[in-house]
């Protein structure tokens, strides 16, 4: 999906008011300095591409993020504020239902959500001019 035509300000507002709170809850008890960011993004569409990938694509050691509250709210925000996003996700959602596993917060998941935190932080910044 190409995130270029999303309403970034509306997604930013959704992140600040709700998604961030669920990330805070998920990461509670974890020091902000515990994990270093290894995933970055260069502009808002790129940030959303990376956010979608980390949030909804199962990875080795962390298969369950898509069912977390922050993930569901992320999905809702993208569906509302990114034209045509919902249609692209129907097949992916059906595939995910078949893979559904028990929710377990592993260290790998905490690390992945820490990466998400960094991506959202970068998405959140208004455009910075390169010197």
């Amino acid at each position: 999906y190409d995130f270029t035509n999303c309403d970034f300000e509306k997604i930013k507002a959704a992140y600040l008011s709700t998604i961030s709170k669920d990330l805070i809850t998920y990461m509670s008890g974890t020091k902000s300095t515990e994990f270093n960011n290894t995933v970055s993004c260069s502009n808002r569409p790129h940030c959303l591409t990376e956010i979608q990938s980390l949030t909804f694509n199962p990875t080795a050691g962390c298969a369950s993020l898509a069912k977390e509250m922050f993930a569901m709210k992320t999905k809702a925000a993208l569906a509302i504020w990114c034209p045509g996003y919902s249609e692209t996700q129907i097949n992916a959602t059906q595939a995910m239902k078949k893979r559904r596993k028990r929710k377990v917060t592993t260290n790998k998941c905490l690390e992945q959500v820490s990466q998400l935190q960094g991506l959202w932080r970068r998405f959140n910044r208004p455009l910075l001019k390169q010197q």
Epitope: L16, S20, N36, N37, G118, Q131
Partner: antibody, heavy 119, light 107 residues
Framework: QVQLQQSGAELVRPGASVKLSCKAS????????MHWVKQTPVHGLEWIGT????????AYTQKFKGKATLTADISSSTAYVELRSLTSEDSAVYYC????????????WGQGTTLSVSS | DIVMTQSQKFMSTSVGDRVNITCKAS??????VAWYQQKPGQSPKTLIF???NRHTGVPDRFTGSGSGTDFTLTISNVQSEDLADYFC????????TFGGETKLEIK
């Protein structure tokens, strides 16, 4: 833990330039934007601008464009603000402050650097 | 630029009281508001971020509320160590802007 250590007080002549530093420790320097804030008794707190250490990207308040230049040195995890063509109006306490973990706020503050501009 | 207005420059309260410090934005800043405390001779300290989240180590007598244009910092059961300046900051859009401080005095 996160610490922002700022350089010591400066006394400089009008018309000169000065470069204040802020050494970050306890976190990955390139992961967080750094902001600079000016505080005076008359104007209170004023946001000067911000820098993304990873890209060198910056943003400034209009008032400080041409007055302040923000830079960052990744190798030493240090952020800088250079102030030029100094006048008595630039006398203030300058703070560096780090972007918050979730964005949309700043969390940790340096101890501040007092700049006095006087002939 | 977005203007943040703290209409109360001074507030006088007694130990054990509850006090509300308010901040009004000139346009919608959603929940991108933080509250800071500054004691004499010290650098500011973060109390509340994203309008209602308490920063690490901040006592639970400090609470933040609001969204859009109207924000409130509530200090319940005021303690003598709460004598300080309090200010809000909007971080929705550059340039980020501070409210004028509210000086809390303890009777």
């Amino acid at each position: 833990q996160v610490q922002l250590q700022q350089s010591g007080a400066e006394l400089v002549r009008p018309g000169a330039s000065v470069k204040l530093s802020c050494k970050a420790s306890g976190y990955m320097f390139t992961d967080y934007a750094m902001h600079w804030v000016k505080q005076t008794p008359v104007h209170g707190l004023e946001w000067i601008g911000t820098i993304d250490p990873e890209t060198g990207g910056t943003a400034y308040t209009q008032k400080f464009k041409g007055k302040a230049t923000l830079t960052a040195d990744i190798s030493s995890s240090t952020a800088y603000v250079e102030l030029r063509s100094l006048t008595s109006e630039d006398s203030a306490v300058y703070y560096c402050t780090r972007e918050g973990s979730y964005g949309g706020y700043v969390d940790y503050w340096g101890q501040g650097t007092t700049l006095s501009v006087s002939s | 630029d977005i203007v943040m207005t703290q209409s109360q420059k001074f507030m006088s309260t007694s130990v054990g009281d509850r006090v509300n410090i308010t901040c009004k934005a000139s346009q919608n800043v959603h929940t991108a508001v933080a509250w800071y405390q500054q004691k004499p001779g010290q650098s500011p300290k973060t109390l509340i971020f994203l309008a209602s989240n308490r920063h690490t180590g901040v006592p639970d007598r400090f609470t933040g509320s609001g969204s859009g244009t109207d924000f409130t910092l509530t200090i319940s059961n005021v303690q003598s160590e709460d004598l300080a300046d309090y200010f809000c900051l909007q971080l929705w859009n550059y340039p980020y802007t501070f409210g004028g401080e509210t000086k809390l005095e303890i009777k």
